[in-house]
Amino acid sequence: EKPVYELQVQKSVTVQEGLCVLVPCSFSYPWRSWYSSPPLYVYWFRDGEIPYYAEVVATNNPDRRVKPETQGRFRLLGDVQKKNCSLSIGDARMEDTGSYFFRVERGRDVKYSYQQNKLNLEVTALIEKPDIHFLEPLESGRPTRLSCSLPGSCEAGPPLTFSWTGNALSPLDPETTRSSELTLTPRPEDHGTNLTCQMKRQGAQVTTERTVQLNVSYAPQTITIFRNGIALEILQNTSYLPVLEGQALRLLCDAPSNPPAHLSWFQGSPALNATPISNTGILELRRVRSAEEGGFTCRAQHPLGFLQIFLNLSVYSLPQLLGPSCSWEAEGLHCRCSFRARPAPSLCWRLEEKPLEGNSSQGSFKVNSSSAGPWANSSLILHGGLSSDLKVSCKAWNIYGSQSGSVLLLQGRSNLGTGVVPAAL
């Protein structure tokens, strides 16, 4: 009866250059327990080589010379006594491509090359990319350990060298970036930047790299309020904004953070649980009223903290003028001017373009001012008759603008009575 030599091994296996592969294998050979028990030696050879002379690619026989080019990379895995001939191939090289056969030897009775079941190995170009592992999310200011590893690689062959590149690494010592692991303390400005891990097998031309975009979680650092695309100046968490009464106002609050903070507007300086007047970063007032003068707060709420800024809104108006109007009264010509403005304006009277300041020392005129609500009133009393036609003007102004009005007093009748002075405005 023919001795039974059998081998179970896949016909072909493909591995990328620089990576590892485990080829499962089992074998059987004729052996009787009453035989003497010389050691069982197994070998993997390159196809086309004569087992008696060739250097082996892998063996458990310490007396057999192993090919220098496969030394340490091709290894028998598993227990040969249990008829396991599994072959581990590490740091695969293009020149490893080819066929291999298995051989068993035990004493003088068992010597056999399994030429019918060859293993065909194909080494292809490396397309596998390394994996960059870290606990997400990256948090600004919190040190995080990152590691770079290549799926399918193993310890076999020359060591792997690593290099890390990216803006987030700029302050690191170059030595740190040559390890498979590094500790990174991300900053807000590192969000969205690229981090690359490149792997190279020492002494080989095989390199592969993976680039990841950093997703750095960070709380808002600053809040900016924009009006018509222009940022308002902020001093000590407060911004001052003068607004023309009656004008429409649209403000945009921006607080860069990741993930985006929840932005809301509040009236005044709110308590933490206050109800917002806007649940977005936009505050819209259709017509600003003087009653809205005071404060608004923009709050940026984020899982990592919150930030808020106070907007001091001052409502202003240009002076509005009623007058002047003049009439004869007992003490002389009495002219009145009414005006309103925010902030309260200054006012002056002019007679024939000459300013009338305070009260005349000679008693020729007298100025009185009073205010009621938003309106302020000023009166001018001119003593004596009119010698000729007169132009009386009143002017109101504040930092935002001015308005003036004038009346032309015509010398017509000598006795005008107490009526309104005919005037040409």
Partner: antibody, heavy 119, light 110 residues
Framework: QVQLQQSGGGLVKPGTSVKLSCKAS????????IHWVKQRSGQGLEWIGW????????KYNEKFKDKATLTADKSSSTVYMELSRLTSEDSAVYFC????????????WGQGTSVTVSS | LMTQTPLSLPVSLGDQASISCRCS???????????LEWYLQKPGQSPKLLIY???NRFSGVPDRFSGSGSGTDFTLKISRVEAEDLGVYYC?????????FGGGTKLEIK
């Protein structure tokens, strides 16, 4: 028990060819390298070449490259050596020998077969 | 080229015999082994393997046979010659093609 049984040879005419056989038994045919060795009467031994059925590998001594052709028939576990264009120089005893194992030695020999070239 | 000396070695039974074999070049194979063998051919018989890889006795070979040497110089020693040891001894190198035998040394009774 490994055995190499030789046959063929005898008296042959000059210019003709002869095919010698070496039938192997007692082992797996593909596991041995079969060598052929020439010994002229009263002379020393000369290595002609080998045939390895495991991978059909054949090696010749350059001196015999145009003289000897080694072949095999796996089904009958036989290795053949054909000697062509025979001359009296080819008259000799031809041995086949089996070489198995890493030890690299011809551990089993056939009994030899004699070739006499004469008209 | 394998040069064997002496060509003939007359000995008395029980004596020690020593045969030398010199190679024209190193016979270390590329795999690191030195395939130097010694064969004995008795009259009318096929050669028989005695020593393989310089110093290893083949199975069934008595321990009075020993081999030594390295590189290019090798020696076969028979510590106490017995009648069955008589015949022609050949050294052989199987490291480089063409494989070659030495010229032979005839061990005979004095």
């Amino acid at each position: 028990q490994v055995q190499l049984q030789q046959s063929g040879g005898g008296l042959v005419k000059p210019g003709t060819s002869v095919k010698l056989s070496c039938k192997a038994s007692g082992y797996i045919f593909t596991e041995y390298i079969i060598h052929w060795v020439k010994q002229r009467s009263g002379q020393g031994l000369e290595w002609i070449g080998w045939f390895y059925p495991g991978i059909i590998s054949i090696k010749y001594n350059e001196k015999f490259k145009d003289k000897a052709t080694l072949t095999a028939d796996k089904s009958s576990s036989t290795v053949y050596m054909e000697l062509s264009r025979l001359t009296s120089e080819d008259s000799a005893v031809y041995f086949c020998a089996g070489h198995e194992g890493y030890d690299g030695a011809m551990d089993y020999w056939g009994q030899g077969t004699s070739v006499t070239v004469s008209s | 080229l394998m040069t064997q000396t002496p060509l003939s070695l007359p000995v008395s039974l029980g004596d020690q015999a020593s045969i030398s074999c010199r190679c024209s070049q190193s016979i270390v194979h590329s795999n690191g082994n030195t395939y130097l063998e010694w064969y004995l051919q008795k009259p009318g018989q096929s050669p028989k393997l005695l020593i393989y890889r310089v110093s290893n006795r083949f199975s069934g070979v008595p321990d009075r046979f020993s081999g030594s040497g390295s590189g290019t110089d090798f020696t076969l020693k028979i510590s106490r010659v017995e009648a069955e040891d008589l015949g022609v001894y050949y050294c052989f190198q199987g490291s480089h093609v063409p494989w070659t035998f030495g010229g032979g040394t005839k061990l005979e009774i004095k």
